[in-house]
Interface confidence: medium
């Protein structure tokens, strides 16, 4: 049977600058905690991504919101404990 | 009002190795086409991502599928034309 081709409009709509879920390393957001381990070691955050149809424009957040997550902090030689860490999410994105 | 905290189980579930939409530059998938421009310049593909709860394990694709998309190929001094490009998507992911 013929290959199903994703039409241009759909390709464009999905590729254009928007807030998409991305898995981000906890320590990249909390570099001061680099000597500790977290479980999970990455978290799902909304991040602006995509292309703008003009190479002089970039997909950037124009609105952000905080989200607080419960993680396990694992200190060597110490019992793991639940901690609450706050991360910044991208809510609205624009090509600028 | 109190901050709403995403509970550990949900954080873990969302962070664990899975296929997530990612916007990928067309020329990174088709490096031989680097002298041409495409519109859009990136496409949305499912890619394995996430953490495995063990730093010796990696989130890898164990099943892939092709997807064919219609894009505009822009050659300098030539009129843009629709082309169909095939990309590999990650269908199933595992920690290995």
């Amino acid at each position: 049977s013929e290959v199903e081709v994703v039409p241009f409009q759909e390709v464009w709509g999905r590729s254009y600058c928007r807030a998409l879920e991305r898995l981000v390393d906890v320590v990249s957001e909390y570099p001061s905690e680099v000597e500790h381990m977290f479980s999970p070691s990455c978290v799902s955050l909304l991040r602006c991504t995509g292309c703008c149809g003009d190479e002089n424009l970039h997909c950037v957040p124009v609105e952000t919101a905080n989200v607080t997550m419960q993680l396990l902090k694992i200190r060597s030689g110490d019992r793991p404990s639940y901690v609450e860490l706050t991360f910044s999410q991208h809510v609205r994105c624009e090509c600028r | 009002s109190e901050v709403e905290v995403v509970p550990f189980q949900e954080v873990w579930g969302r962070s664990y190795c899975r296929a997530l939409e990612r916007l990928v530059d067309v020329v990174s998938e088709y490096p031989s086409e680097v002298e041409h421009m495409f519109s859009p310049s990136c496409v949305s593909l499912l890619r394995c991502t996430g953490c495995c709860g063990d730093e010796n394990l990696h989130c890898v694709p164990v099943e892939t599928a092709n997807v064919t998309m219609q894009l505009l190929k822009i050659r300098s001094g030539d009129r843009p034309s629709y082309v169909e490009l095939t990309f590999s998507q990650h269908v199933r992911c595992e920690c290995r």
Partner: antibody, heavy 122, light 112 residues
Framework: QVHLQQSGAELMKPGASVKISCKAT????????IEWVKQRPGHGLEWIGE????????NFNEKFKDKATLTADPSSNTAYIQVSSLTSEDSAVYYC???????????????WGQGTTLAVSS | DVVMTQTPLSLPVSPGDQASISCRSS???????????LHWYLQKPGQSPKLLIY???NRFSGVPDRVSGSGSGTDFTLKISRVEAEDLGVYFC?????????FGGGTKLEIK
Amino acid sequence: QVHLQQSGAELMKPGASVKISCKATGYTFSSYWIEWVKQRPGHGLEWIGEILPGSVSNNFNEKFKDKATLTADPSSNTAYIQVSSLTSEDSAVYYCARSTGFYYGGNYFDHWGQGTTLAVSS
Amino acid sequence: DVVMTQTPLSLPVSPGDQASISCRSSQSLVHSNGHTYLHWYLQKPGQSPKLLIYKVSNRFSGVPDRVSGSGSGTDFTLKISRVEAEDLGVYFCSQSTHVPPTFGGGTKLEIK
């Protein structure tokens, strides 16, 4: 599991605007289009338009272009339709639905909200 | 817009019988990519529509194999073998080959 929860019934006056919400759970909100469909007795189901959450991408049925505004907030996994300049013709049940888009093979509406009844009356 | 015409408007059947619903489109539903985007939905009384069949003949998850779809071009059929009480409701065909997507007027399946 995928679930779309819509806001409650509305009784509005002619000329006013109404905003109906559709909260999505159980899947990656930004990866699927949200469709809006109108149903009124004797007129069957009519597609209003669609939005890809988190993006500026939306498509409309020409008939509803000046009537409906579609928005989505990825941080709360909620899509909205605002219907403006209300008349009795806008009295209907409004459904949100999740659509695969052509991307996953066919633009069919695989999960639907429970519907929101809008009554317009003076 | 593509007009979708369903027949019959009402279909009274006895439990255990076979029901057949026809759907005709005003133009071909074969997409330029070779696929046919014709789908069937069921709306039970007081509920929202639910997807039954997508792309002519593919059963959506959880749909029993008593329900089947067939057809091509402009003529399509939904068949329900061994009708049960839970099958009653309004069946809609829908196309998404052309923009805007459009729906048939519905066929009401009633138990005799």
